[in-house]
Interface confidence: low
Amino acid sequence: GELETSDVVTVVLGQDAKLPCFYRGDSGEQVGQVAWARVDAGEGAQELALLHSKYGLHVSPAYEGRVEQPPPPRNPLDGSVLLRNAVQADEGEYECRVSTFPAGSFQARLRLRVLVPPLPSLNPGPALEEGQGLTLAASCTAEGSPAPSVTWDTEVKGTTSSRSFKHSRSAAVTSEFHLVPSRSMNGQPLTCVVSHPGLLQDQRITHILHVSFLAEASVRGLEDQNLWHIGREGAMLKCLSEGQPPPSYNWTRLDGPLPSGVRVDGDTLGFPPLTTEHSGIYVCHVSNEFSSRDSQVTVDVLDPQEDSGKQVDLVSAS
């Protein structure tokens, strides 16, 4: 006859490990007992359990409550045992020694591998600002056994670098994602993907990129200067910019205080019916935590009377 076992039994941390040992004998052969021991090199044999055909299962004190026989129905030639709730310290070599009648003793070894799935963590890098060079956007760390694979899934252009630290029974892998920040990256997802044989599917942690920037400011509303005449109602100046974080707006007048009746509403400066007092240089000041920008425009309120007078003068002069 011969023993059937596995070279390697792989389980995930916390699962039950079935250690197989089946005697395939000739007709009429019987199994008297099966002895299981841990036989890591240099450790000496450490008995797990003894499975006796007549007296049943005897578990050594070190494994009390952790070694069982598989549930029925049981084949008398099957010497397999279950090791409950596998931990990393269980990883190693095991031997089953089968005593048969009349063929004698057989032994076989297997290796138990305990996979420790990683619990990945993602740490964003320093604040991203437009204009920086290659900058750390995020780092992702995962520790497990064996070493996990850490990659990145993103539409954003960047570079990755990884390093790993080996511990006695596991390895920690850290991958960094570097990029050159630009405003187009705002709101883009950067996903750390961790693969490991102990995971049914890849673990994914997503970080949303935030890149600080402030666009140049410009003022709208003066496109047609002829509309800025005495008495016009509803005249307004609008300050255009964009940024991350969203900017705040402040209006001032360069050549004095804002005229009475002029309303500041965020990015918009609203005028009462125009008078010549509203002529002047207006400054829109845009700022966020990243930067500040200014844009200034000159408002020249036209007096239709003056204009028509000028025209008459010109005509008479000709």
Partner: antibody, heavy 115, light 111 residues
């Protein structure tokens, strides 16, 4: 002492492939990326790409993407660059360079593409 | 890709005089704290040798007659006083983004 040892010159036919080894010693192989640089005769230098030996992550210059493949064998601390579908334009010296500041270069491998 | 333009393409300098090589980038390669520009020396039949890292940091073992300066888009390599052994081709290279690119090179001859 950091050393990057490259193989000798290669004469290959147009359309064929070449695979250049670069054996690293004197430092921890997985601590640095391995970059590859091309220099045509009498011309400047072109960065081809790099590979991170830790996780085999590669970055390529778009110009070489699809034709150049970078790999590593951690057990022998050796990096490889394979270039496929060679033409006379690929005749050049190819250098492996230790990443993170190009302070250490291999001696270069001359690849001549000729019928 | 960032284009690095070196000038002059070739340069003849008398022994003991100053050699100045410039490198202009098509866009800024500097932050407020760092310039991602590096300089190399290459002699015939040899691989390039790193001289200066991050625009102005002299690499260990490189003689003090080599110096680098500049930021943003304009960088210079100075050699003073030049010696016979400085006859070589000099390249600038950026590491601002991928792909890294090199300048076209400046050939320095000593007379």
């Amino acid at each position: 002492e950091v050393l990057l040892q490259q193989s000798g010159p290669e004469l290959v036919k147009p359309g064929a492939s070449v695979k250049i080894p670069c054996k690293a010693s004197g430092y921890t192989f997985t601590d640095y990326t391995m970059d590859w640089v091309k220099q045509s005769h009498g011309k400047s230098l072109e960065w081809i790409g790099d590979i991170n030996p830790n996780n085999d992550v590669t970055m390529y210059n778009e110009k070489f993407k699809g034709r150049a493949t970078l790999t590593v064998d951690k057990s022998s601390s050796t990096a490889y660059m394979e270039v496929r579908s060679l033409t006379s334009e690929d005749t050049a010296v190819y250098y492996c360079v230790r990443g993170r500041g190009f302070a250490y270069w291999g001696q270069g491998t001359l690849v001549t593409v000729s019928a | 890709d960032i284009v690095l333009t070196q000038s002059p393409a070739s340069l003849i300098v008398s022994l003991g005089q100053r050699a100045t090589i410039s490198c202009r980038a098509s866009q800024s390669v500097s932050t407020s704290s760092n310039s991602y520009m590096h300089w190399y020396q290459q002699k015939p039949g040899q691989p390039p040798k790193l001289l200066i890292r991050f625009a102005s940091n002299l690499e260990s073992g490189v003689p003090a007659r080599f110096s680098g300066s500049g930021s943003g888009t304009y960088f210079t390599l100075n050699i003073h006083p030049v010696e016979e052994e400085d006859s070589a081709t000099y390249y600038c290279q950026h590491s601002w983004e991928i792909p890294y690119t090199f300048g076209g090179g400046t050939k320095l001859e000593i007379k």
